[in-house]
């Protein structure tokens, strides 16, 4: 995250780092009590390594009474999600088994009507991404809160020059942004999961290349049978 | 697949108005902006301006701004040039063009003539 | 206001030639962002322009590999590598890094 600050510790009990060997790669969100929701590019170099999934963290790697790891049942990447594009970068995560729910673990509501957000709302977005454009990570969470931009502005020549399907969304990026690491992490938009972070290796903090999250009411349908 | 269709277009006496229409199709209307290009026979492109059908934001060509005035009916996919004081020199194809990607779709363009 | 000048105006050439169209600007359209929005449109008689290059190099889906774009900073090149019958047409360098957006004056390239 850039140009943000640390998170209130425990304050975003649906947050998760999903893990490749034991190191963050990138984050999640909790929609169930087994399955989390990230971002499909985030596993396609993970080949042979261990993917687990941390919950109930804010220090990934303090000890913290509510922190948990979780073995990885099933890894469900969307069927149309491709290495060389952006569309369709979802993936769902089924956990060894239920996770222990409490204040500092819970799912997150996630947005079900297939309607834009309004351009300039402020959504949260939060992760263990780096947070300069020297590449240092960050050990506790971090967050911002960055307006909606509308899908016109974000197809503009000079900013995603039509990329931008119905299925994503857009968030301004003037210093203030996700990055590298926040990918598959979530956009809360009051109190509701309305986008996931996006994996592409997209310059962070330029105000003409805007955050892209994936909108996963367009993704209702396929996460329902996924979870089914 | 994307469409403009461009009308409007025809013979306008000089000082007098026209409102030319572009009616998109094939894709999500309010996802790209809308630019208009003018051509005048046997000369090169020209931008008039631009607008975005979200926030109904203009931006035009200094040589445009108080004459020409861009609208929208997003119910309607479609996107207005408004021409006001319509001088001899107007007299040209009309094209309205997505950006996005680039000006990849254009459509077919509509002739203004302005003569008395 | 950025002006782009294309040169020649008009060209004879023959199929199969190699043809070469260059585009200077009066000054950089190195956008803020690091890119640069210099793209080529192909014109046919009464017909839209066709997007060809995008961002300097860059051939749109759908364009031979015969087209092919160049170029840094003020001055930009387009190429046809062995010219067909389909494309004696007018091509036009573009600008679109900084508003007002801009065309080149034409280049027509006509038969021998």
């Known amino acids: 995250i850039l140009g943000g600050r640390e998170a209130e510790a425990h304050a975003r009990p649906y947050m998760a780092s999903v893990q490749l060997n034991g190191a963050h790669l990138c984050g999640g969100v909790l929609v169930a009590e087994q399955w989390v929701l990230s971002a499909a590019h985030c596993l396609e170099d993970a080949a042979d390594g261990k993917v687990q999934v941390l919950l109930g963290a804010h220090s990934l790697s303090q000890p913290e009474p509510s922190k948990r790891l979780y073995d990885v049942l099933r890894a469900v990447p969307h069927p149309d999600s491709q290495p060389d594009t952006i569309d369709h970068d979802l993936l769902l995560l089924q956990l060894s088994e239920k996770a222990t729910l409490g204040p500092a673990v819970r799912p997150l509501p996630w947005q079900r009507v297939d309607r834009d957000v309004a351009p300039g709302t402020l959504c949260d977005v939060a992760g263990w991404g780096i947070v300069n454009h020297a590449g240092r990570r960050p050990d506790s969470l971090q967050h911002v809160l960055l307006p909606v931009l509308d899908r016109a502005t974000c197809n503009r020549r000079t900013h995603h020059d039509g990329a931008i399907t119905e299925r994503l969304m857009c968030a301004e990026s003037n210093r203030r942004d996700s990055c590298k690491g926040d990918s598959g992490g979530p956009l809360v938009c009051g109190g509701v999961l309305e986008g996931v972070v996006t994996s592409g290796s997209r310059v962070c903090g330029n105000r003409k290349k805007p955050g892209i999250y994936t909108r996963v009411a367009s993704y209702a349908a396929w996460i329902d049978s996924v979870l089914a | 697949e994307v469409q403009l269709v461009e009308s409007g277009g025809g013979l306008v006496q000089p000082g007098g108005s026209l409102r030319l229409s572009c009616a998109a199709s094939?894709?999500?209307?309010?996802?790209?902006?809308m630019n208009w290009v003018r051509q005048a026979p046997g000369k090169g492109l020209e931008w008039i301006g631009d607008i975005n059908p979200v926030t109904g934001d203009t931006d035009y060509n200094a040589d445009f701004k108080r004459r020409f005035t861009f609208s929208l009916d997003t119910s309607k996919s479609t996107a207005y040039l408004q021409m006001n004081s319509l001088r001899a020199e107007d007299t040209a194809v009309y094209y309205c063009?997505?950006?996005?990607?680039?000006?990849?779709?254009w459509g077919q363009g509509t002739l203004v003539t302005v003569s008395s | 206001d950025i002006q782009l000048t294309q040169s020649p105006s008009s060209l004879s050439a023959s199929v199969g030639d190699r043809v070469t169209i260059t585009c200077r600007s009066s000054?950089?359209?190195?956008?803020?962002?690091?890119?640069?929005?210099l793209e080529w449109y192909q014109q046919k008689p009464g017909k839209a322009p066709n997007l060809l290059i995008y961002?300097?190099?860059n051939r749109f889906s759908g364009v031979p590999s015969r087209f092919s774009g160049s170029g840094s900073g003020t001055d930009f090149t387009l190429t046809i590598s062995s010219l067909q019958p389909e494309d004696f047409a007018t091509y036009y360098c573009?600008?679109?890094?900084?508003?007002?957006?801009?065309f080149g004056q034409g280049t027509k390239v006509e038969i021998k």
């Open positions: 573009f600008q679109g890094s900084h508003v007002p957006v801009t």
């Open positions: 000054q950089t359209i190195v956008h803020s962002n690091g890119d640069t929005y």
């Open positions: 961002k300097v190099s």
């Open positions: 094939g894709y999500h209307f309010t996802s790209y902006y």
């Open positions: 063009t997505r950006e996005g990607p680039s000006f990849a779709y």
